[in-house]
């Protein structure tokens, strides 16, 4: 039975040209995290394998930095980066947990972080 929950940074906003940290945290399970995939719609941004470290998709390699931890730092933001991002936790023996973050990239300098929320 899958008992875990993923806590994410929720709905967040950031300035164009700036950077943002995408973070998820898996709790309430003793399952072992084998890999975390970071995806945006149909695109793979990066993978963090617990043993083999990071794989960064070449289309993002100049704008993505691994970490902190299992998170991902997205740099040099453009308005085209607005959208849904998913952290997909591959765990053993539970299986897959998915968290969702919505990022809005703003033209203005008024960019406030949204509240954290949980996805069961």
């Amino acid at each position: 039975m899958m008992t875990g929950t993923i806590e994410t940074t929720g709905n967040i906003s950031a300035e164009k040209g700036g950077s943002i940290i995408l973070q998820c945290h898996l709790s309430s399970t003793t399952a072992q995290v084998t890999q975390v995939n970071w995806e945006q719609q149909d695109q793979l941004l990066a993978i963090c394998n617990a043993d083999l470290g990071w794989h960064i998709s070449p289309s993002f390699k100049d704008r993505v930095a691994p970490g902190p931890g299992l998170g991902l730092t997205l740099q040099s933001l453009t308005v085209n980066d607005t959208g849904e991002y998913f952290c997909i936790y591959h765990t053993y023996p539970d299986g897959t947990y998915t968290g969702r973050i919505f990022l809005e990239v703003l033209e203005s300098s008024v960019a406030e972080h949204g509240a954290r929320f949980q996805i069961p």
Partner: antibody, heavy 119, light 107 residues
Framework: EVQLQQSGPELVKPGASVKISCKTS????????MHWVKQSHGKSLEWIGG????????SYNQKFKGRATLAVDKSSNTAYMELRSLTSEDSAVYYC????????????WGQGTTLTVSS | DIVLTQSHKFMSTSVGDRVSITCKAS??????VAWYQQKSGQSPKLLIY???YRNTGVPDRFTGSGSGTDFTFTIDSVQAEDLAVYFC?????????FGTGTKLELK
């Protein structure tokens, strides 16, 4: 120039063990994952596992876990794969292959080591 | 484990032809697919990574495309030296797996 030089062919008896080496040069050994791949005669490729030399992280294909052991000697920039309890099914060519920088695909391959298991 | 199916074990072609080799994944692997060329008696050689990126030094007649579950490797104008076995590989999740291979041969 990046080079991966593997040890020579091996002829061993069923039930025995073998240790294949992969001596590297031309790059910073600890910065790149080393993968090991099996190719049975005339067949496809099978990923055995990968090892990240900087932190010792190892990922095994469950099919080989318990019989295969991956290791490195950072002082000599050499990767090793030991395979135990050998059977005729293990007769194959074994490759070491360097994982590309911040990627999981393999951009440089050793020349292969032919293992024959026969009594 | 993710299964990669290369439906054609053999493909016949002529020098100068355009040829496409397909690879189908048993589940969504986004763009985490590489293509390797293996000539007889040699080690595999990386041609394409992340579905569509050409490895350093690979001629531009080689291209890769696709995402999700369906991938294609194309040689625009086959040369005699392209006769080899071509394998796809997924690196979306461990264990990393390879396709069964497609052998390109002359008609």
């Amino acid at each position: 120039e990046v080079q991966l030089q593997q040890s020579g062919p091996e002829l061993v008896k069923p039930g025995a063990s073998v240790k294949i080496s992969c001596k590297t040069s031309g790059y910073t050994f600890t910065e790149f994952t080393m993968h090991w791949v099996k190719q049975s005669h005339g067949k496809s490729l099978e990923w055995i596992g990968g090892l990240k030399p900087d932190n010792g992280g190892i990922s095994y294909n469950q099919k080989f876990k318990g019989r295969a052991t991956l290791a490195v000697d950072k002082s000599s920039n050499t990767a090793y794969m030991e395979l135990r309890s050998l059977t005729s099914e293990d007769s194959a060519v074994y490759y070491c292959a360097r994982g590309a920088y911040y990627r999981y695909d393999a951009d440089y391959w050793g020349q292969g080591t032919t293992l024959t298991v026969s009594s | 484990d993710i299964v990669l199916t290369q439906s054609h074990k053999f493909m016949s072609t002529s020098v100068g032809d355009r040829v496409s080799i397909t690879c189908k994944a048993s589940q969504d692997v986004k763009t985490a697919v590489a293509w390797y060329q293996q000539k007889s008696g040699q080690s595999p050689k990386l041609l394409i990574y992340s579905a569509s990126y050409r490895n350093t030094g690979v001629p531009d007649r080689f291209t890769g495309s696709g995402s999700g579950t369906d991938f294609t490797f194309t040689i625009d104008s086959v040369q005699a030296e392209d006769l080899a076995v071509y394998f796809c590989q997924q690196h979306y999740s461990t264990p990393f797996t390879f396709g069964t291979g497609t052998k390109l041969e002359l008609k």
